[in-house]
């Protein structure tokens, strides 16, 4: 991608670059991408895939460049890399290009999905595991039950998913999960598809959020404080109906009995 | 001034029911979870459990997970940490924090700060 | 859950010295969710640091905080009397939340 003839890693080894204050940001957003050479440098141009030129010059005498994107469009997403040079080299040649720098810039992250593990059928004593899977790796994964409007659990995760165990008593119930990036300026994903968890014989179901009857989105906490999470008593005490996929277990984050739960 | 009070301190008896409190004031209480950390005599930090009071909600560390009952009332500002049967290892200093709660679009978030505020403490002491 | 391991479990030095506090976690911990608190004998824990590196309102930046992954610093770069106290790192990113067992910085 990068024209410019570029030497044997020995000779001139590849720079770091970063984007501050992320690589995923809102439109709008001013976004500095940093090259950092390991040696004082003339000359930084950044490069994006497809570009005969770079993309950007910057000429000063140190280690490090800064490459101003100012209020950053959806358009100026994409893939980058950095490479730097010094006067005493020949012409047209340039450093080993940086690692790539992939930066997004969007309002909302996709959809995550939300499946049940391990499946299909476990006992009243046994925990049950929601899987939240996303598409990118070191994201905050937010779990969250229906009518309430505080997550159930959370976790930062270097994958692109995380797993959330609830304890088999307190399992059923309606469930949805988004993920959103660990630092400012935060960007959040559309809501999963909720996932409904219930006893053997009622049958597990996903449906689309915004076909979810009664569905309350996290947000504004519920009116009716006795509604924040179906009664338990209603659940005949059998098997949970899950949907199956690899087994994958994590430390639980309890959450309180449901109000109209006096005491499983 | 924004700031947290908590409750006096308590000596009980094994068996006996408590129940401490602690008042926010000088900011928005439904905007920050209540935090409630354990320190027993001569030992660290234990997170118990965090309440949001905008629903009332909490969530419970495992290890206190039926053990204790966390509750708010926000039209005054006071959440509360109760026991139903004490016992001597609940001997210890309880603490109650803030910590910001983070929205975007109107969905509450993983917490993005620290707990900033806390209050003096309450202590509790189980003795027979 | 993530644990944190902090040490050393006890800091001897004397005021004027540089403090090095490290605390490391049992698995990774995004740095926006990790904080270091102080207390003192008798008193509620203090805020000193969080999102691993930014300093709370009103604390001197004396103090600071760096690291991510699974390895963290909290550096106190010429401790002054007040600072002999209990340091407490914490994770609030993943429930449940968790804290180390704390460094005693004591008088040499």
């Known amino acids: 991608d990068i024209t410019p003839s570029v030497p044997p890693a020995s000779y001139h080894p590849k720079p770091w670059l970063g984007a501050q204050p992320a690589t995923v940001v809102t439109p709008g957003v001013n976004v500095t991408l940093r090259c950092r050479a390991p040696q004082p440098a003339w000359r930084f141009g950044l490069f994006k895939p497809g570009e005969i030129a770079p993309l950007l010059f910057r000429d000063v005498s140190s280690e490090l460049a800064e490459f101003f994107l100012e209020e950053v469009t959806p358009a100026q997403g994409g893939i980058y890399r950095c490479c730097y040079r010094r006067p005493d080299w020949g012409p047209g040649v340039w450093s080993q290009p940086s690692d790539v720098l992939e930066l997004l810039v969007t309002e909302e992250l996709p959809r995550p999905s939300l499946v049940a593990l391990p499946g299909p059928v476990v006992g009243p004593g046994a925990n049950v595991s929601l899987r939240c899977a996303g598409r990118l790796r070191n994201m905050s994964f937010v779990l969250y039950r229906e009518g309430v409007a505080a997550p159930l659990q959370y976790r930062h995760s270097a994958q692109p998913w995380a797993d959330f165990t609830l304890l088999g008593a307190r399992a059923p119930g309606t469930y949805s999960c988004y993920y959103h990036t660990p630092s400012a300026p935060y960007v959040l994903s559309q809501r999963s598809e909720v996932l409904v968890i219930s006893w053997e014989g009622e049958g597990p179901e996903a449906r689309p959020a915004s076909s979810a009857p009664g569905m309350q989105a996290p947000g504004p906490p519920p009116s009716d404080p006795g509604a924040q999470a179906p009664s338990l008593s209603s659940f005949r005490p059998r098997g949970l109906v899950l949907q199956p996929l690899l087994p994958q277990t994590q430390d639980s984050w309890d959450p309180a009995p449901p109000p109209s739960d006096p005491g499983v | 001034e924004v700031q947290l009070v908590q409750s006096g301190a308590e000596v009980k008896k094994p068996g006996e029911s408590l129940k401490i409190s602690c008042k926010g004031s000088g900011y928005s209480f439904t905007s920050y979870w209540i935090v409630w950390v354990r320190q027993m005599p001569g030992k660290g930090l234990e997170w118990m459990g965090s309440?949001?009071?905008?629903?009332?909600?909490?969530r419970y560390s495992p290890s206190f997970q039926g053990q204790v009952t966390i509750s708010a009332d926000k039209s005054i500002s006071t959440a509360y940490l109760q026991w139903s049967s004490l016992k001597a290892s609940d001997t210890a200093m309880y603490y109650c924090?803030?910590?910001?709660?983070?929205?975007?679009?109107?969905?509450?978030?993983?917490?993005?700060?620290?707990?900033?505020?806390w209050g003096q403490g309450t202590t509790v002491t189980v003795s027979s | 859950e993530i644990v944190l391991t902090q040490s050393p479990g006890t800091l001897s030095l004397s005021p004027g010295e540089r403090a090095t506090l490290s605390c490391r976690a049992s698995q990774s911990v995004s740095s926006s969710y990790l904080a270091w608190y102080q207390q003192k004998p008798g008193q509620a824990p203090r805020l000193l640091i969080y999102?691993?590196?930014s300093r709370a309102t009103g604390i001197p930046d004396r103090f600071s905080g760096s690291g991510s992954g699974t390895d963290f610093t909290l550096t106190i770069s010429r401790l002054e009397p007040e600072d002999f106290a209990v340091y407490y790192c914490?994770?609030?990113?993943?429930?449940?939340?968790?804290f180390g067992g704390g460094t005693k910085v004591e008088i040499k």
């Open positions: 309440i949001y009071p905008g629903d009332s909600d909490a």
């Open positions: 999102g691993a590196s």
């Open positions: 914490q994770q609030y990113g993943s429930s449940p939340l968790t």
């Open positions: 924090a803030r910590q910001k709660i983070t929205m975007v679009r109107g969905v509450i978030i993983t917490p993005l700060d620290g707990m900033d505020v």
